[in-house]
């Protein structure tokens, strides 16, 4: 039961995480104008991975897409790539994990196959989460560097008369969404990998029990699980399962709906 719960929870956590990664990638507020000590601004700038926006205090908002590919900073391209890789891996991981769920029966799929699929999806979620965290962190680092550079050149005086106020940018909401979502996907992936160990049918190497009959001796080995899946052979505290009984499979649990904000 614990294995099913761990696998189910891992799936749900990863699902929320990947939804968050998608949301973060699409959000416009990766970097927002630093307002210093002034919370009210007449013109507020914010930028995403795909477009930059300006919101006036009049309420008018205008967004412009980055219609150039070659003209964009390499770091921004790298962040985009990391986030997309994260989404793609996560989506594939979700697809694989659906079929791997213990509570869902697909034909006569063996537990070893489900274990392998659970491990695969788990690894995919881990890599997906790491991609998202890396992408967000690279962007955050870029912001910090630019922030201090623009602080150093806060006012570029022209002949000491005219001043140009440089717009400084700070962390936007998307960065925090991305970090949390990446973390959740990572946690979900770890949970799937843990669940995989519980799902894995292990080869039982029980010591032979000798029964001495009159005239000759017969060595009898009780039947264990079918085949080892190669996840390690721990002979300590092995449980003997009835090969035919599948108590956890009898009760099907359906994943509940979640609202993503």
């Amino acid at each position: 039961m614990a294995v099913t719960a761990c696998q189910g929870l891992g799936f749900v956590v990863s699902l929320i995480g990947i939804a968050g990664i998608i949301a973060a990638t699409c959000m416009d507020q990766w970097s927002t104008q630093d307002l210093y000590n002034n919370p009210v601004t007449a013109v507020f700038n914010y930028q995403g991975l795909w477009r930059s926006c300006v919101r006036e205090s009049s309420g008018f908002t205008e967004c412009r897409g980055y219609f150039t590919l070659l003209g964009l900073p390499a770091m921004l391209q790298a962040v985009r790539a990391l986030m997309i890789v994260g989404i793609v891996l996560g989506a594939i991981g979700l697809l694989v994990s659906i079929f791997a769920l213990k509570c869902i029966r697909i034909g006569s799929m063996e537990d070893s196959a489900k274990a392998n699929m659970t491990l695969t999806s788990g690894i995919m979620f881990i890599v997906s989460g790491l991609c998202a965290i890396a992408g967000v962190s690279v962007f955050a680092n870029m912001l910090v560097t630019n922030f201090w550079m623009s602080t150093a050149n806060m006012y570029t005086g022209m002949g000491g008369m005219v001043q140009t106020v440089q717009t400084r940018y700070t962390f936007g909401a998307a960065l925090f969404v991305g970090w949390v979502a990446g973390g959740l996907t990572l946690i979900g992936g770890v949970m799937m990998c843990i669940a995989c160990r519980g799902l894995a049918p292990e080869e039982t190497n029980y010591k032979a029990v000798s029964y001495h009959a009159s005239g000759h001796s017969v060595a009898y080995k009780p039947g264990g699980f079918k085949a080892s899946t190669g996840f390690g052979s721990n002979t300590k505290n092995k449980k003997i399962y009835d090969g035919g009984a599948r108590t956890e499979d009898e009760v099907q649990s359906y994943p509940s709906k979640h609202d993503y904000v």
Epitope: C53, V54, E56, S57, F60, R64, V162
Partner: antibody, heavy 118, light 113 residues
């Protein structure tokens, strides 16, 4: 048709207070910031502050903090500006204006003349 | 605060002639996010409130005759009336619409020569 109708002229003694109203019609009152601007005789226009009719949030020019207080009555689609501790230099025409695209004022009230004299 | 300085203080132009009013700001009014200049021009006739002519330095407000045009970027801006009409006699103000507090120029009085 968008209209901003202000209250009539006021004559006040130094130290007194005055409350100027600005009734909006012809548009959704809660969708636009309402700004107040003053024009003293022979002087340039001066921005006093603004209030958002939906949230009630305000922002003032430092020069007018403590002098002007912006309030509103959403149900009556009316914005108010109260000026306290009046002095002769507060004698001016006070305008309410609606903020639009480009952070520009597209509609203005007709102006309220406040005269402060002893 | 951004200081807005207009020149000249007064201007006399013959009917049908071109009138040019300049406005200079102490800080750039160009917003890098959308490459728009947050400068507004108003016209004020005696006993009337100001009337919006141009916003974003060069975008004409609807209903404003096309003889009015705005230009400039950063800190230097110009309002041009291509062919002066009698009804254009007024005081013209430029306004910083980029940062609070909004500030106005001292005004330029336009008269007919």
């Amino acid at each position: 048709e968008v209209q901003l109708v202000q209250s009539g002229a006021e004559v006040k003694k130094p130290g007194a207070s005055v409350k100027v109203s600005c009734k909006a019609s012809g548009y959704t009152f809660t969708s636009y910031w309402m700004h107040w601007v003053r024009q003293a005789p022979g002087q340039r226009l001066e921005w006093i502050g603004m209030i958002h009719p939906n949230s009630g949030s305000t922002n003032y020019n430092e020069k007018f903090k403590g002098k002007a207080t912006l309030t509103l009555d959403k149900s009556a689609s009316t914005a108010y500006m109260e000026l306290s501790s009046l002095r002769s230099e507060d004698t001016a025409v006070y305008y309410c204006a609606r903020l639009k695209t480009g952070n520009s004022f597209d509609y203005w009230g007709q102006g309220t003349t406040v005269t402060v004299s002893s | 605060d951004i200081v807005m300085t207009q020149s000249p203080d007064s201007l006399a132009v013959s009917l049908g002639e071109r009138a040019t009013i300049n406005c200079k700001s102490s800080q750039s009014l160009l917003n890098s996010g959308n490459q728009k200049n947050y400068l507004t021009w108003y016209q004020q006739k005696p006993g009337q409130p100001p009337k919006l002519l141009i916003y974003w330095a060069s975008t004409r407000e609807s209903g404003v005759p096309d003889r009015f045009s705005g230009s400039g970027s950063g800190t230097d801006f110009t309002l041009t009336i291509s062919s002066l009409q009698a009804e254009d006699v007024a005081v013209y103000y430029c306004q910083n619409a980029y940062t609070y507090p909004f500030t106005f120029g001292q005004g330029t009085k336009l008269e007919i020569k």
